[in-house]
């Protein structure tokens, strides 16, 4: 009987109440293996979640998180807020990163601007919330005289779009 | 030297999966972004994603988020991609490249990968 | 996701020729604009990084200029070993994009 049940293609199970039958998954289930005995349910993509690839006989359905949120853990399985570039997002909300770090994206943490130092380079560009420094030739390589860091850019959105 | 070493070349069945490495020495490997970048033949170079051995924290391009997983090993100062359910159009030369100081450019480069995918 | 246009796809010059290639993004990147070098042996060399920035160790003859949209990338006086590919590439914003390549040969 079990060499019955292998015969189950994707997207079908084995009934055991019709006798070994390979039977179509019933709606909003899936497999995604031959030789199942059930079927699984279908992924939901509901409330913060949004539905990317809908479910179908042999897949999963894949949910992506909705404007304003982003993914986290294997296959989305939780929404996190979003902040805005120079924040992270705390217990309580999302607070500006503080001063000698930056955050460049919508998530994640704030990090200490690169030590340029660290590899015998000078600072060209100055760190600033929404943006690490930008490292530079080394001191040495810099002409007598010259200043080794120029002022940030002027502060403008660059519309970053993280995963 | 500072220097990015990357595995040989590998030749997979379509719907395998691969692991490559990128083996960094001569700096401090938590201190900098690991980036992969896959150049098909004939084609120009596009950015997979990128790794901060440090916390592990990653990016992904949206094109790849379902094909590649990026991973370091702090302890050997090693980073990897691993590209599942392998296709033909995944045949390509792979690089991984550190960051110069900051992400925005990329100072190192690994000597790259082949992947081909064949039947 | 930003697109990088550049441009020529490939061009042929003579020994001591001025080269110069463009790269214009879709949208306003700053500074955040580098150029790369990648030799027939497919090795890949930082040139050029923030715009005009000269990468220690890389020739004088390369330059580069702009900025938002708009940059310039220059070989003063081309030499032999230059026979390479050249990519522009943006790091302003994820992910992370380069143009399709220049494809300098020597007449």
């Known amino acids: 009987l079990q060499d019955l049940c292998s015969n189950c293609p994707a997207g079908t199970f084995c009934d055991n109440n019709r006798s070994q039958i390979c039977s179509p998954c019933p709606p909003n289930s899936f497999s995604s293996a031959g030789g199942q005995r059930t079927c699984d349910i279908c992924r939901q993509c509901k409330g913060v979640f949004k539905t990317r690839k809908e479910c179908s006989s042999t897949s999963n359905a894949e949910c992506d998180c909705i404007s304003g949120y982003h993914c986290l853990g294997a296959e989305c399985s939780m929404c996190e807020q979003d902040c805005k570039q120079g924040q992270e997002l705390t217990k309580k909300g999302c607070k500006d990163c503080c001063f000698g770090t930056f955050n460049d994206q919508k998530r994640g943490i704030c990090r200490p601007w690169t030590n340029c130092s660290l590899d015998g380079k000078s600072v060209l560009v100055n760190g600033t919330k929404e943006r690490d420094v930008v490292c530079g030739p080394s001191p040495a390589d810099l002409s007598p005289g010259a200043s080794s860091a120029t002022p940030p850019a002027p502060a403008r959105e660059p519309g970053h779009s993280p995963q | 030297q500072v220097q990015l070493v990357q595995s040989g070349a590998e030749v997979k069945k379509p719907g395998a999966s691969v692991k490559v490495s990128c083996k960094a020495s001569g700096y401090t490997f938590t201190s900098y972004w690991i980036n992969w970048v896959k150049q098909a033949p004939g084609q120009g170079l596009e950015w997979i994603g990128n790794i901060y051995p440090s916390d592990s924290y990653t990016n992904y391009n949206q094109k790849f988020k379902d094909k590649a997983t990026i991973t370091a090993d702090k302890s050997t100062s090693t980073a990897y991609m691993e590209l599942s359910s392998l296709r033909s159009e995944d045949t390509a030369v792979y690089y991984c490249?550190?960051?110069?100081?900051?992400?925005?450019?990329?100072?190192?480069w690994g000597q790259g990968t082949t992947v081909t995918v064949s039947s | 996701d930003i697109q990088m246009t550049q441009s020529p796809s490939s061009l042929s010059a003579s020994v001591g020729d001025r080269v110069t290639i463009t790269c214009r993004p879709s949208?306003?990147?700053?500074?955040?604009l580098n150029w790369y070098q990648q030799k027939p042996d497919k090795t890949v060399k930082l040139l050029i990084y923030?715009?005009?920035r000269l990468r220690s160790g890389v020739p004088s003859r390369f330059s580069g200029s702009g900025s938002g949209t708009d940059f310039t990338f220059t070989i003063s006086s081309l030499q032999p070993e230059d026979i390479a590919t050249y990519f522009c590439q943006q790091g302003d914003t994820l992910p992370y994009t380069f143009g399709q390549g220049t494809k300098l040969e020597i007449k």
């Open positions: 923030y715009t005009s």
């Open positions: 490249t550190r960051d110069y100081g900051s992400a925005y450019s990329y100072s190192l």
């Open positions: 949208q306003d990147i700053s500074n955040y």
